[in-house]
């Protein structure tokens, strides 16, 4: 995966929120649920209020890039989603508030929002050829591709 | 199904310690925090701690920081909590309960232990 | 910490009854608040989460609705059943704090 030097000198400026308390599906129809603290995993469920909620802010590019940038927030929280290493879960870091300028090491913060049709995804900015991605009997990771699911339905206003 | 079963009940001396397990099944022990709550004869519910049941972090409530201690055995999916330095205070049922977040931010206890009964006296 | 005062601490009332409890945080808990049930020499059941929703199984006599810093549980036509003691809980953050309970009786 790429190191997180790599796009150092690029700078994100928050926008705005572009979705509010949406839920991720993955293609096995798992959602993604919160579990022990900081670990996001997934789950089949009876009951869809288990389904973390989230909250999506996007990102404006100094370079201009034709991707859409988002920072994923759970809804109601000040927690937000951040990438590691490939294999790694990835972990919920707690933030007094959006942060409005995001450059350098922080990049693991954000992710480029690709759609195909109803399938969602989500790459690490800090590292470009990794997907936020579910996995059998694991944490919601970020992955290369499978076995790992990288493909997600946003489901909205779910009451 | 998910069961929390926990041991049975326990007579001990002041200033002794005594270790509870908690049992669980149903579901992937290690997905879900578990809870230790514990209630005086004829009181409320008192919240005790938790303990990451990925990590083996705990958390415990300031009535008893130093006092308890959570383990965990996840060969086994059993969850240990053990309070020393009893006294006649101590008196109570001690619950186990396992954690839930709903929509990721708001925490509940959906399953609990059928509770062990721990008396102390001389 | 969020401390949880709930009232009253005791209520008597007759079958078919409205029973109404109250909960009140001191400090906003963005609608994080639940409610169980216990009943004598019983483990505690989770009855309502997140304020207003029903745990599954959970009849519909029972609901709950509030914001900020107060809570009400509500019991829309009281059963014999019901007899036993209601706790609310915050679950904004550590530690996670219960009400003292309210005991409930029929008359």
């Known amino acids: 995966s790429a190191p997180f030097s790599f796009l150092s000198n690029v700078k994100y400026n928050f926008m705005r929120i572009i979705k509010y308390e949406f839920i991720l599906n993955d293609a096995l129809n798992q959602s993604i649920i919160r579990a022990n603290d900081q670990y996001l995993t997934a789950a089949a469920l009876h009951n869809l209020d288990e389904a973390v909620k989230f909250d999506m802010g996007a990102y404006k590019s100094s370079k201009d890039d034709a991707k859409i940038t988002v920072i994923l927030r759970i809804s109601k929280t000040q927690l937000y989603v951040t990438a590691q290493d490939e294999d790694q879960p990835v972990l919920l870091k707690e933030m007094p508030e959006i942060p409005k300028t995001i450059t350098g090491s922080e990049t693991n913060l954000l992710f480029f929002w690709e759609t195909h049709g109803t399938k969602n995804y989500f790459t690490s900015v800090a590292h470009p050829n990794l997907f936020i991605a579910t996995k059998q009997d694991y944490w919601v990771c970020l992955a290369g591709g499978p076995p790992s699911i990288t493909d997600f339905q946003i489901l909205e206003n779910q009451a | 199904e998910v069961q929390l079963v926990q041991s049975g009940a326990e007579v001990k001396k002041p200033g002794v310690s005594v270790k509870v397990s908690c049992k669980a099944s149903?579901?992937?022990?290690?997905?879900?925090?578990m809870h230790w709550v514990r209630q005086a004869p004829g009181q409320g519910l008192e919240w005790m701690g938790w303990i990451n049941t990925y990590t083996g972090e705990s958390t415990y409530a300031d009535d008893f920081q130093g006092r308890v201690t959570f383990t965990l055995d996840t060969s086994t999916s059993t969850a240990y909590m053990e309070l020393s330095s009893l006294r006649s205070e101590d008196t109570a049922v001690y619950f186990c309960?396992?954690?839930?977040?709903?929509?990721?931010?708001?925490?509940?206890?959906?399953?609990w232990g059928q509770g062990t009964t721990v008396t102390v006296s001389s | 910490d969020i401390q949880m005062t709930q009232s009253p601490s005791s209520l008597s009332a007759s079958v078919g009854d409205r029973v109404t409890i109250t909960c009140r945080a001191s400090q906003d808990i963005s609608n994080m608040l639940n409610w169980y049930q216990q009943k004598p020499g019983k483990t505690p059941k989770l009855l309502i989460y997140?304020?207003?929703r029903l745990y599954p199984g959970v009849p519909s006599r029972f609901s709950g609705s509030g914001s900020g810093t107060d809570y009400t549980f509500t019991i829309s036509s009281l059963q014999p059943e019901d007899i036993a003691t209601y706790f609310c809980?915050?679950?904004?953050?550590?530690?996670?704090?219960f009400g003292q309970g309210t005991k409930l009786e029929i008359k």
């Open positions: 309960a396992r954690g839930i977040y709903y929509y990721g931010s708001s925490y509940a206890m959906n399953y």
């Open positions: 997140y304020t207003s």
């Open positions: 149903g579901y992937t022990f290690t997905t879900y925090g």
């Open positions: 809980q915050q679950g904004k953050t550590l530690p996670y704090a």
